[in-house]
């Protein structure tokens, strides 16, 4: 398929509440009207889909209601937020962008963002 450049940060540290945000930017070779953005997680040689959203240019991203991802779009830039992360979710998160319409189809894969998640220390019991 026709290739497209996608840029994303190399490293992001999740907040203590398990939230990680990063920007995914793509170099659109044409005037796409419908774009699909997918977050993939690569662990070892396994690639799994974390979440996906489609948006019409000029409109907002819409993830499924039960998705752990939210996001906003601005031109060729997508701001992605992944919630509910725990230490075991530390890994490489790849931004994939597909220009669905109009033809031809373009696909771009970022190099991935290494997201580090540190579980918060449990609060010690305190007497009041």
């Amino acid at each position: 398929c026709k290739a497209m450049h996608v840029a994303q940060p190399a490293v992001v540290l999740a907040s203590s509440r398990g939230i990680a945000s990063f920007v995914c930017e793509y170099a659109s070779p044409g005037k796409a009207t419908e774009v699909r953005v997918t977050v993939l997680r690569q662990a070892d040689s396994q690639v799994t889909e974390v979440c996906a959203a489609t948006y019409m240019m000029g409109n907002e991203l819409t993830f499924l209601d039960d998705s752990i991802c939210t996001g906003t779009s601005s031109g060729n830039q997508v701001n992605l937020t992944i919630q509910g992360l725990r230490a075991m979710d530390t890994g490489l998160y790849i931004c994939k962008v597909e220009l669905m319409y109009p033809p031809p189809y373009y696909l771009g894969i970022g190099n991935g963002t290494q997201i580090y998640v540190i579980d918060p220390e449990p609060c010690p019991d305190s007497d009041f």
């Epitope: 398929c1 026709k2 290739a3 994939k96 031809p104 189809y105 696909l107 894969i109």
Partner: antibody, heavy 123, light 108 residues
């Protein structure tokens, strides 16, 4: 083993409609994009239409756009091609073919094919 | 639309000989090219994908090479069952997916 079985072909008059079906088994149908490819008698292969693995996107060859509609029912492992306003030049063997959707490289090649069903458009 | 041109249209060879089939694209398709074999009355079968990778169950005598606009399918030593029509197909710039017009490999 993988099986794709087309049905619904036959002889039809120009301007009329026909619906083809393709029953799939032996693989995870919902992970595969599905195509229709046709072959006119004694001619080469011509791609007709593609539907995304989850049915969300559809693409057509210019020669059938606006006349043919591709659809799928993942609960029934079945692919369809609704053909309207048929023309003599639509006469061909119609094959359904699967194409795995790779997460990193997108839709793949036509890895499994049915045996084909013949559609003849003639008055 | 990318046009794929195959040559020769017909290739007459004997079993045991080496067959070289060519496919040329009207613009670069990188390595996103496949080869299919079709025997009379049968559906096509995927032989080679991404220019040089053999599909599952395809004998080692089949090999593919090339990138950009020029591709080659080689059958190192022809077996009787290899005589068929061969098509190349690209997935670089779609829709539409396009096929070459085919090369008929016949027994000399």
């Amino acid at each position: 083993q993988v099986q794709l079985v087309e049905s619904g072909g036959g002889v039809v008059q120009p301007g009329r409609s026909l619906r083809l079906s393709c029953a799939a088994s032996g693989f995870t149908f919902s992970s595969y994009g599905m195509h229709w490819v046709r072959q006119a008698p004694g001619k080469g292969l011509e791609w007709v239409a593609l539907i995304w693995y989850d049915g969300s996107y559809k693409y057509y060859a210019d020669s059938v756009k606006g006349r043919f509609t591709i659809s799928r029912d993942n609960s029934k492992n079945t692919l369809y091609l609704q053909m309207n306003s048929l023309r003599a030049e639509d006469t061909a063997v119609y094959y359904c073919a699967s194409a795995y959707y790779d997460l990193l490289t997108g839709p793949y090649y036509f890895d499994y094919w049915g045996q084909g069903t013949l559609v003849t458009v003639s008055s | 639309e990318i046009v794929l041109t195959q040559s020769p249209a017909t290739l007459s060879l004997s079993p045991g000989e080496r067959a070289t089939l060519s496919c040329r694209a009207s613009q670069s398709v990188s390595s996103y090219l496949a080869w299919y074999q079709q025997k009379p009355g049968q559906a096509p079968r995927l032989l080679i994908y991404d220019a040089s990778n053999r599909a599952t169950g395809i004998p080692a005598r089949f090999s593919g090479s090339g990138s950009g606009t020029d591709f080659t399918l080689t059958i190192s030593s022809l077996e009787p069952e290899d005589f068929a029509v061969y098509y190349c197909q690209q997935r670089s710039n779609w829709p539409p997916y396009t096929f070459g017009q085919g090369t008929k490999l016949e027994i000399k």
